[in-house]
């Protein structure tokens, strides 16, 4: 469930603190409820960038698990199509710390509406 997703995000945050990754990532910091799945997709795609750039097994495994969890939760809700949402590349670029904070916010949005 989404609580496990948040714990994975916390784990990624802790793992990243011990590394020096200065990537900037496309971050949706003001998610409109009607675009939350699209925003989640962007967050997950950017997480893969973190995983790739870190080259770290723990980060890789945690990112993969997080994607598996999110996929399964969202697929159980059926296919959700959203329109008029921003493309990932249109989002503001932020540092990893801010990115992860925004990611937690969107997950909490899913928790509040489930």
């Amino acid at each position: 469930n989404w609580v496990n997703v948040i714990s994975d995000l916390k784990k990624i945050e802790d793992l990243i603190q011990s590394m020096h990754i200065d990537a900037t990532l496309y971050t949706e910091s003001d998610v409109h409820p009607s675009c939350k799945v699209t925003a989640m997709k962007c967050f997950l795609l950017e997480l893969q960038v973190i995983s790739h750039e870190s080259g770290d097994t723990d980060i890789h495994d945690t990112v993969e698990n997080l994607i598996i969890l999110a996929n399964n939760i969202l697929s159980s809700n059926g296919n959700i199509t959203e329109s008029g949402c921003k493309e990932c590349e249109e989002l503001e670029e932020k540092n990893i710390k801010e990115f992860l904070q925004s990611f937690v916010h969107i997950v909490q949005m899913f928790i509040n509406t489930s």
Epitope: T57, H60, D61, I67
Partner: antibody
Framework: EVRLMASGGGLVQPGGSLRLSCAAS????????MSWVRQAPGKGLEWVAT????????YYPESVKGRFTISRDNSKNTLYLQMNSLRAEDTAVYYC???????????????WGQGTLVTVSS | DVVMTQSPLSLPVTLGQPASISCRSS???????????LEWYQQRPGQSPRLLIY???NRFSGVPDRFSGSGSGTDFTLKISRVEAEDVGVYYC?????????FGQGTKLEIK
């Protein structure tokens, strides 16, 4: 050439336990997630379990959840499947398989072992 | 769970002729990141399964180019442009977009 050698199969009574092993060689074992897939006699393939590269994350179908445990020892390049509370329907050839992850181009089981037969019967 | 349904279950083919196997999923297997984790595996008689195609249409290394994969969403196809004797066996589609990962029932290809 990637090599996966499954072992540990045999005859076991219903309710019994068995531990399968899969010895990996010719690749960096810790860089890959691993899976077990089984095939009942004359039947199709069924996914049984997957474990992450570091071993922290495991995934199972409902048919084996709570009875089977996948684990790995990266220092020994070995994958395991602990099978408890075995049932007649668990009778199958069990294959271990290496799982490519998205960083290397998608999720797929790219190399498979030769399989080990588990027979559950009284 | 995602159910994978293959057809036909048995496929008699003349050597040198094309062959086509269909695989349908009970729901879309496009994951949230836009990837479709659909593979095709070949199992020759008495052998372990072997990866042919991953992510719908990518041929695995060493797989002859007579094998091709296509499809999207819920409908997928494996095509063999010209069947050879060594192609005899059972072919399985497999989705690992969503847990539990699931195989199709298998399609047995035999020579007429």
């Amino acid at each position: 050439e990637v090599r996966l050698m499954a072992s540990g199969g045999g005859l076991v009574q219903p309710g019994g336990s068995l531990r399968l092993s899969c010895a990996a060689s010719e690749f960096t074992f810790s860089n890959y997630a691993m899976s077990w897939v089984r095939q009942a006699p004359g039947k199709g393939l069924e996914w049984v379990a997957t474990i992450s590269r570091g071993g922290d994350y495991t995934y199972y179908p409902e048919s084996v959840k709570g009875r089977f445990t996948i684990s790995r020892d990266n220092s020994k390049n070995t994958l395991y499947l602990q099978m408890n509370s075995l049932r007649a329907e668990d009778t199958a050839v069990y294959y271990c398989a290496r799982r490519v992850s998205f960083i290397t181009g998608g999720w797929a089981m790219d190399y498979w072992g030769q399989g080990t037969l588990v027979t559950v019967s009284s | 769970d995602v159910v994978m349904t293959q057809s036909p279950l048995s496929l008699p083919v003349t050597l040198g002729q094309p062959a086509s196997i269909s695989c349908r999923s009970s729901q879309s297997i496009v994951d949230i990141t836009g990837n479709t984790y659909l593979e095709w595996y070949q199992q020759r008689p008495g052998q372990s399964p072997r990866l042919l195609i991953y992510k719908v249409f990518n041929r695995f290394s060493g797989v002859p180019d007579r094998f091709s994969g296509s499809g999207s969403g819920t409908d997928f196809t494996l095509k063999i442009s010209r069947v050879e004797a060594e192609d005899v066996g059972v072919y399985y589609c497999f989705q690992d977009s969503f847990v539990p990962y699931t195989f199709g029932q298998g399609t047995k290809l035999e020579i007429k």
